[in-house]
């Protein structure tokens, strides 16, 4: 077990803070909830603290919760491939570019680390080149979320990982908005981290609303499990 993994044996409170600017539309989001890495489970509620969110909530899911991939459930035979937990408590910097097909892109930079007993994800997001009447600024996405695979590989030069994956957002007219994600994670501290073999995270997310919440918000339930590496021979003969 890595030192960082020991911090995730129970339920951990999560705080998310985002400052965003998309085509000049500035906004802030605050999120709170908890994660349980034993089950790969996240429960979070996000509130736009600046009024109405200028982009659809589903376009921010990867920035919020795929930001705290340290809560992914890594099966016993894959624990030596869990970079995310191994970087804790000092944490990691997570940078992404998210390309929306036939539209603009988001660039994000986040620091994910423990502050006391709370896992904090502080994010800056900049979006450019979006069409004012497109699927994103035109709010044409359905309020739901599909399952995805998130592909992870080691980046030995930077002592971190590279990640890529594609999200499919459902559009109200029945079509799909594609969003191609390119991600890099590097540790904040200088302690040892686990550099993984190639594998992926399998994610399932459910979006809902709080009937008692008047502000623009999103409630998120997510399950994430690592896969893609088979048992070694030593595992088979135990």
């Amino acid at each position: 077990m890595s030192k960082g993994e020991e911090l995730f044996t129970g339920v951990v409170p999560i705080l998310v803070e985002l400052d965003g600017d998309v085509n000049g539309h500035k906004f802030s989001v605050s999120g709170e909830g908890e994660g349980d890495a034993t089950y790969g489970k996240l429960t979070l509620k996000f509130i736009c603290t600046t009024g109405k969110l200028p982009v659809p909530w589903p376009t921010l899911v990867t920035t919020f919760s795929y930001g705290v991939q340290c809560f992914s459930r890594y099966p016993d035979h894959m624990k030596q491939h869990d970079f995310f937990k191994s970087a804790m408590p000092e944490g990691y910097v997570q940078e992404r570019t998210i390309f929306f097909k036939d539209d603009g892109n988001y660039k994000t930079r986040a620091e994910v680390k423990f502050e006391g007993d709370t896992l904090v994800n502080r994010i800056e997001l900049k979006g450019i080149d979006f069409k004012e009447d497109g699927n994103i600024l035109g709010h044409k996405l359905e309020y739901n979320y599909n399952s995805h695979n998130v592909y992870i590989m080691a980046d030995k030069q930077k002592n971190g990982i590279k990640v890529n994956f594609k999200i499919r957002h459902n559009i109200e007219d029945g079509s799909v908005q594609l969003a191609d994600h390119y991600q890099q994670n590097t540790p904040i501290g200088d302690g040892p981290v686990l550099l993984p073999d190639n594998h992926y995270l399998s994610t399932q997310s459910a979006l809902s609303k709080d009937p008692n919440e008047k502000r623009d918000h999103m409630v998120l339930l997510e399950f994430v499990t690592a896969a893609g590496i088979t048992h070694g021979m030593d595992e088979l003969y135990k």
Epitope: N149, Y151, N164, F165, D180, N198, H199
Partner: nanobody, 130 residues
Amino acid sequence: QVQLVESGGGLVQAGGSLRLSCAGSGGTFSAYTMGWFRQGLGEERELVACISRSGASTFYTDPVKGRFTISRDNDKNTVYLQMNNLKPEDTAVYYCAADWTVIDEITEQRSKHQTSYDYWGQGTQVTVSS
């Protein structure tokens, strides 16, 4: 919406060759990593080979390495699969698939997963007799 149409399948004797083609229309062909998959009777659909947007990078699965060659012509919106030294175990329906991607690289594990692909052809049957 990208449409993909495969052709070139057929019946061939073991040791023979076939060249499959997949013609794309309705989108920017060069914006897609292209893959060839196959599905034998009662088997799961599996990746055979894939090629990056420009054609600079390719990937082959072990059973076809050294026998199959994937290539593309973006001016003709077409991807090819040259299959040599065919074996009876190559018998399957062969499908062409397109994965919209921003970078001109192959990510092996992403390309192996069917779920990465956005558009699929209807398939062409390849039968190799012994």
